[in-house]
Every structure is written in structure tokens, then in C-alpha cells.
């Protein structure tokens, strides 16, 4: 005949409070015959977690019919886990004896512990905006796990970056524990649309991570480039000129017209476009009256992105006749 | 819902014999073990013995050996408690319980000449 | 045979006050296999305290139950009037099993 085993599958087993947990025993043997009991911890002061036939186990019931012929699966479920429920369940066959059953034989026992799920990561990025080819900090933060142990990972767009530094605290015992990451990301000039994302990795979560995500378009800041042109063509006694404001991020953005250092207060006709990457366009025209009396006119575009300091770009209209010369200089 | 139900109230001479019945529903007595009880008037409780209905084997308390004989009958979800040469200390009141949990409603034996 | 002895036999208190009821084990007894009943009189005994401190489904709160080895106790920590009755502690630890003499809990 085959000896019989108690097998225990699981070593450990996490748990949830409030949770079932399910803890699993099989034979592999029909004899001798006598019950399959149930215990925490070993010795003379083991508690008895499930007797079938006698007891009050509220909490308790069998995954398979015990009482089927041919039974061999003594596997149990608990309801509504709690921290005292920690320890380590042994299944223990017995042999029917008397005037005492005795023990025969005990699996190899399963521990549980418990498991608590981490928090959502929690995503923060810079207080201010960078600009590109900077490196900005973004810190990544969840509570509450155990056990200890937790993987943590960074990705900008999918590419996984490995310039970073976390911490779980405490470093000691506790009932649960908090990770803090540190990512360094150097900016790029098209990463309004980028994305860095936390991902949190944790045995309670059963191979289904955590995420947690900020945007680049929140952290970057990409300046403008100026250019002002004139038309070649002139209506009358007007020439219009036209300042591009182009690549610039956020929308945020004050433009002025100078006539020869006067601002001019006049309306003038803009558009704003957004461009694949994310970042504006700003164009505005500005319609300038001339007479061949009228001594040269420089007209400066200047531009305030973000509260940043400005910038403009300078046209002189060297106006003839024929309106053939033109030329321009940038001053920051 | 778990039930059950004992058999009426006896009265019996001393020598005499007398089986008093447990049935049950709500449950397979199979499962269980099936105890039975002793209350004599005004007094305590006393344990007098069980079954393992599975496979009819028993227990029994030292006091009682030998006078008392439990049985079950799976077929019908019924236990029995058996006790013979009966005299005047064992008026009691008899209760069948499931595995300590669940008691049924105890049954009067009164034992006169 | 493990012996329980209970006290006091009697108990006499009011409503309101804590009860105390001891229940003391010849030899040990394992926790898991402690139990206490209650009965009334006319009825059988209801399962109310099991594995020596969990109380069985629609018990109050103000029961509790707590010791180990040869020493248990079951606490009630204000006496409502529905709560006079027999207590009786329990031991499955070992053949036979034994009931102590039971603790009556009286109205003063």
C-alpha cells in the first residue's frame, strides 16, 4: 500500500483583511482510517482551526465534499481574515484509535500572512517648468503594502529609465510599509506629449501592477522662436508685416507691436495653431501706413512667453518707391 | 436551518430499558458527530457519550459504560441513546447535540417504581 | 478525567454590574477546546462562547471569554436582566468529555 502524504502546496499564503483565504491539503492516501483536522502552530497549545465532524467553526468550511467516498482533498476556506489569523496552518491526519484518536501524520504546514495592497502611486513633478535639455525630478510615492518587498519602476513613453532612487520605509518589522522614488527625466524639446509613468509591483496585486502617471506637458516649458517678415506686396499705403511665434509651450503668451519704439495699441489679426508635438504657433500681422514722405520705420515684435523674460525681433521697413530693400536683426 | 427533533417524554421501572430517539434535518447526520447528554433534575450536566455515524464507532464516559449503547441509522438522519438497567438516579432529562453546536429540545425519562 | 470546577456556584449581582465567572481544569486544556453554555430554565443549553473567547453568532458584546491552560473565565461586562441563567464551561480536549457544575447567575 502507498504511504500516505499530506501535501501543502503553498509555503506562504497572503492574505487580505476582510478577505477568504484558502488554504490547501491533500492525501494521497485513503488510509488509515481517521479524520484530517485542521491546526495552527504545533505542540500542545496548537489551535484547532477545523474539526469536521465536531466543534463550532463558524468561519470555516471545506472547499471539496469531505464526506464524499474516495475524498481526498481536505483543503479548507476562511472567512473574513483578520491580523490575528496570522501564523502557520498545519492539516494533521489521525488514525482512529482508542480510547484516543492519535496522530498520524502532518503536512508540511502553510504560513499565512498578511498582505495589504499598496496605494495607487501618487505622481508628482517639478513645482516649476524646465526647458528642454534640463533634468527635472519627479517623485513617485505608495503606502500601506506588505509585505516588504515591492518592485518599482520608471518609463517615459514606454522606455523604461534607470536613473532613479527609492526608498521603503521603515526598514524594520512593521504591519505595513510606504516606497518613494525619485526619477531623474532630461526634458526633450517634443515632450509635451510625454508621459512618465510609475509602476508599482506588488505580490497582493497577483501580476497586475500598479500605474501612476504624470505629464511632461506639466513640467516643460518650451520657448518660442521669433521671425518677422514683410510682404512683398503693398495695398495702397499699407505694408504688412508679420510676426511668426513658432515651437512655444505652454499657450500662454503676451504679444506686442513697436512703430519705432511706440507700442501700438491698435488691433492687429492673429492666429494660434497646435503642432503634431503638442506645442503653438502664433502668427499676428500688423499693417503699417506709409507715404514716400515717411522716414524709415523699425517695427519690433515682442513676445512674453509664460511669464519668462521677453523677447523680440526687429524689422526695418526701409520703404521706396518700390519698396525693393528690406532687412531685419533680432535683439534678445 | 439545522434541526433536532427527540422523542417524548418516558417513564420506566427500575431494571428497565429505555431508547430515546434523536432526529435530525438540515443536515446529513453522516457529518457529525452525534453526543448525547445527561441533566439530572436541578443538577449539572453530564456527557455521556457520542458516535461517528460514518462508521458507527463510539465513546463513551466511564459512568455510563457498559449500560448505554448509542446508534445512528444514516438512512434516516437518526441517532439513538440507549440505556439499560435503569434506576431512580437516572431521571433525567437526555439531549442528543451535533458536534457540541446544536442541542435538541431533551427528553424527560423518569424512572419509578 | 479532567475535572472543571466552577465558581462560585451561585452569583448574585444586578443589572449593570460586571459578572466574573471562573471555570478551573484539573489538568490543561487546550483554548480551541474550551466552550461555555448558557441555559434557562426549561431549555436546553445554547452554545455560547467557543474556543475559549469567540462568541457564537447573535451573542452581545458585553460577553467575553478569555484564559488558558487551567484557568477560564467568561465576563460579562454589564449585566443586562436576559443574561440570568446557568453558565456551564466545557471541555472536548479529552475523553470523556466534562461539563462543570455550572455557575447559576441570580438577580440580587
Known amino acids: 500500500e502507498e504511504e500516505l502524504q499530506m501535501i501543502q502546496p503553498e509555503k506562504l499564503l497572503l492574505v487580505t483583511v476582510g478577505k477568504t483565504a484558502t488554504l490547501h491539503c491533500t492525501v494521497t492516501s485513503l488510509l488509515p482510517v481517521g479524520p484530517v483536522l485542521w491546526f495552527r502552530g504545533v505542540g500542545p497549545g496548537r489551535e484547532l482551526i477545523y474539526n469536521q465532524k465536531e466543534g463550532h467553526f463558524p468561519r470555516v468550511t471545506t472547499v471539496s465534499d469531505l464526506t464524499k467516498r474516495n475524498n481526498m482533498d481536505f483543503s479548507i476556506r476562511i472567512s473574513s481574515i483578520t491580523p490575528a489569523d496570522v501564523g502557520t496552518y498545519y492539516c494533521v491526519k489521525f488514525r482512529k484509535g482508542s480510547p484516543e484518536n492519535v496522530e498520524f501524520k502532518s503536512g508540511p504546514g502553510t504560513e499565512m500572512a498578511l498582505g495589504a495592497k499598496p496605494s495607487a502611486p501618487v505622481v508628482l513633478g517639478p513645482a516649476a517648468r524646465t526647458t528642454p535639455e534640463h533634468t527635472v525630478s519627479f517623485t513617485c510615492e505608495s503606502h500601506g503594502f506588505s509585505p516588504r518587498d515591492i518592485t518599482l519602476k520608471w518609463f517615459k513613453n514606454g522606455n523604461e529609465l534607470s536613473d532613479f532612487q527609492t526608498n521603503v520605509d521603515p526598514t524594520g518589522q512593521s504591519v505595513a510599509y510606504s516606497i518613494r522614488s525619485t526619477a531623474r527625466v532630461v526634458l526633450d524639446p517634443w515632450d509635451v506629449r510625454s508621459q512618465v509613468i510609475c509602476e508599482v509591483a506588488h505580490v497582493t496585486l497577483q501580476g497586475d501592477p500598479l500605474r501612476g502617471t504624470a505629464n511632461l506637458s506639466e513640467a516643460i516649458r518650451v520657448p518660442p522662436t521669433l521671425e518677422v517678415t514683410q510682404q512683398p506686396m503693398r495695398v495702397g499705403n499699407q505694408v504688412n508685416v508679420t510676426c511668426q511665434v513658432r515651437k512655444f509651450y505652454p499657450q500662454s503668451l503676451q504679444l506686442t507691436w513697436s512703430e519705432n519704439g511706440n507700442v501700438c495699441q491698435r488691433e492687429t489679426a492673429s492666429t494660434l495653431t497646435e503642432n503634431k508635438d503638442g506645442t503653438y504657433n502664433w502668427t499676428s500681422w500688423f499693417l503699417v501706413n506709409i507715404s514716400d514722405q515717411r522716414d524709415d520705420v523699425v517695427l519690433t515684435c515682442q513676445v512674453k512667453h509664460d511669464g519668462q523674460l521677453a523677447v523680440s525681433k526687429r524689422l526695418a521697413l526701409e520703404v521706396t518707391v518700390h519698396q525693393k530693400d528690406q532687412s531685419s536683426d533680432a535683439t534678445p | 436551518e439545522v434541526q433536532l427533533v427527540q422523542s417524548g417524554a418516558e417513564v420506566k421501572k427500575p431494571g428497565a430499558t429505555v431508547k430515546i430517539s434523536c432526529k435530525v434535518s438540515?443536515?446529513?447526520?453522516?457529518?457529525?458527530?452525534m453526543h448525547w447528554v445527561q441533566q439530572a433534575p436541578g443538577k449539572g450536566l453530564e456527557w455521556i457519550g457520542r458516535i461517528d455515524p460514518e462508521d458507527a464507532e463510539t465513546k463513551y464516559a466511564p459512568k455510563f459504560q457498559g449500560r448505554v449503547t448509542i446508534t445512528a441509522d444514516t438512512s434516516t438522519n437518526t441517532a439513538y441513546m440507549e440505556l439499560s438497567s435503569l434506576r431512580s438516579e437516572d431521571t433525567a432529562v437526555y439531549y442528543c447535540?451535533?458536534?457540541?453546536?446544536?442541542w435538541g429540545q431533551g427528553t424527560l425519562v423518569t424512572v419509578s417504581s | 478525567e479532567i475535572v472543571l470546577t466552577q465558581s462560585p456556584a451561585t452569583l448574585s449581582l444586578s443589572p449593570g454590574e460586571r459578572a466574573t465567572l471562573s471555570c478551573s481544569a484539573s489538568s490543561s486544556v487546550s483554548s480551541s477546546y474550551l466552550y461555555w453554555y448558557q441555559q434557562k430554565p426549561g431549555q436546553a443549553p445554547k452554545l455560547w462562547i467557543y474556543s475559549t473567547s469567540n462568541l457564537a453568532s447573535g451573542i452581545p458584546a458585553r460577553f467575553s471569554g478569555s484564559g488558558s491552560g487551567t484557568d477560564y473565565t467568561l465576563t460579562i461586562s454589564s449585566l443586562e436582566p436576559e443574561d440570568f441563567a446557568v453558565y456551564y464551561c466545557?471541555?472536548?480536549?479529552?475523553?470523556?468529555?466534562?461539563f462543570g457544575q455550572g455557575t447559576k447567575l441570580e438577580i440580587k
Open positions: 438540515g443536515f446529513n447526520i453522516k457529518d457529525y458527530y
Open positions: 447535540d451535533r458536534g457540541l453546536a446544536y
Open positions: 466545557h471541555q472536548w480536549s479529552s475523553y470523556p468529555y466534562t
